[in-house]
Amino acid sequence: DYKDHDGDYKDHDIDYKDDDDKLVPPGEDSKDVAAPHRQPLTSSERIDKQIRYILDGISALRKETCNKSNMCESSKEALAENNLNLPKMAEKDGCFQSGFNEETCLVKIITGLLEFEVYLEYLQNRFESSEEQARAVQMSTKVLIQFLQKKAKNLDAITTPDPTTNASLLTKLQAQNQWLQDMTTHLILRSFKEFLQSSLRALRQMGDLISVPVDSRGSEQKLISEEDL
């Protein structure tokens, strides 16, 4: 049991995890397999489930981070946060109840996820016992981006981060001292979690605006297999 000031993780129950504490892709957990009579997932449910799957992965990664360092209780995070340009939802992005705008919001979600990719790459060598989960979060985020890109009417408005800038940022982050690397890991996980939560709320407002084709096997489709990428 442990606690951090970002939330209470004492009841760390994760929907898509099996007994080995490994992430199970949506559609592959025992609940899905045991319910062949269930209706196939709709497109919006697919995306919804994919985001929740990623969030569960983040939850597991944060558990390891908070257990091995005191970053989760640190009051110095504001200082470190100023040096990171992590994507964040704001009123102008059209994703909140007030001033909601489907198109603007969808562009923000995709742009934000693309911007997070470099930070997810940074996370890949930051975990010992949760290495697979870090990889799963990264790969399933790529799939989520693809799902959403298929549905964005205004693809021109989506700015893709510059690979050279990303490579330079990655080098800079990896060159930090141990304390700053731990803090960076904590801040990335916290910010990514918040961004996905905001996205989930917004996508639920959109409802069936999102329509990813559902294959004939319904809910049994693997959501995060690398072959899909």
């Epitope: 000031h5 970002d6 939330g7 209470d8 993780y9 009841d11 760390h12 129950d13 994760i14 929907d15 449910e45 919804d48 489930k49 985001i51 929740r52 969030l55 569960d56 939850s59 964040k88 939802m89 909140f96 109840q97 909601f100 918040e194 961004f195 996905l196 939560q197 905001s198 989930l200 709320r201 639920r204 407002q205």
Partner: antibody, heavy 118, light 109 residues
Framework: QSLEESGGRLVTPGTPLTLTCTAS????????MSWVRQAPGKGLEWIGY?????STYYANWAKGRFSISKTSTTVDLKMTSLTAEDTATYFC???????????????WGPGTLVTVSS | YDMTQTPASVEVAMGGTVTIKCQAS??????LSWYQQKPGQPPKLLIY???TLASGVSSRFKGSGSGTEYTLTISGVECADAATYYC????????????FGGGTEVVVV
């Protein structure tokens, strides 16, 4: 960890009123927070949430008349154009943040009574 | 996303079993919580995500359901279980009148 509401009192119809919820033992900035009310002898009625991303969501009936804001130690509920129907005990509650959007309310204050009467 | 709770009131004998139902107007993907409220007290979280018991809650309380239909079952009812029980959807907070059901009063006889 605890929450305590304050500011409830007897007011006349049309009077604006602000209720404050104060946290002890934790920082509110890391949690989704909610206001819920309960008229005498009635059920729970959700007013709204303020999330960690600073966004606010309100019940359809509360939009425009109720407003939620937050600091690291307090959550305020601003109410305008009060009528007798707004007479209720007002609770603030903390959302659990261990997961995604499952906004369960795992810590509640004792409530503060607002009476609207002429 | 309206939540309809039934029955409004139920009498149960000590040691008996009581079942409370909650129906959502649309699927809420198992994001449903149950609360217990006693007179003069704030609500207390009992169950979240349909079936997970909150810390310190007796295993006599059991939650189940999926999609739009959810159930709270209290077995081996005790005097202390006399209270009003509410369901709450945690799925969507947009275009909602109330995230809570209307409540069920459990009277132990």
């Amino acid at each position: 960890q605890s929450l305590e509401e304050s500011g409830g009192r007897l007011v006349t119809p049309g009077t604006p009123l602000t209720l404050t919820c104060t946290a002890s033992g934790f920082s509110l900035s890391s949690y989704d927070m909610s206001w819920v009310r309960q008229a005498p002898g009635k059920g729970l009625e959700w007013i709204g949430y303020i999330y960690t991303d600073t966004s606010t969501y309100y019940a359809n009936w509360a939009k425009g008349r109720f407003s939620i804001s937050k600091t690291s130690t307090t959550v305020d509920l601003k109410m305008t154009s009060l009528t007798a129907e707004d007479t209720a005990t007002y609770f603030c509650a903390k959302g659990s943040t261990d997961y995604a959007f499952d906004t369960r309310l795992d810590l509640w204050g004792p409530g503060t009574l607002v009476t609207v009467s002429s | 996303y309206d939540m309809t709770q039934t029955p409004a009131s139920v009498e149960v004998a000590m040691g008996g079993t009581v079942t409370i139902k909650c129906q959502a107007s649309q699927s809420i993907s198992n994001e449903l919580s149950w609360y217990q409220q006693k007179p003069g007290q704030p609500p207390k979280l009992l169950i979240y995500r349909t079936s997970t018991l909150a810390s310190g809650v007796s295993s006599r309380f059991k939650g189940s359901g999926s999609g739009t239909e959810y159930t709270l079952t209290i077995s081996g009812v005790e005097c202390a279980d006399a209270a009003t029980y509410y369901c709450q959807q945690g799925y969507n907070s947009n275009d909602v009148d109330n995230v809570f059901g209307g409540g069920t009063e459990v009277v132990v006889v």
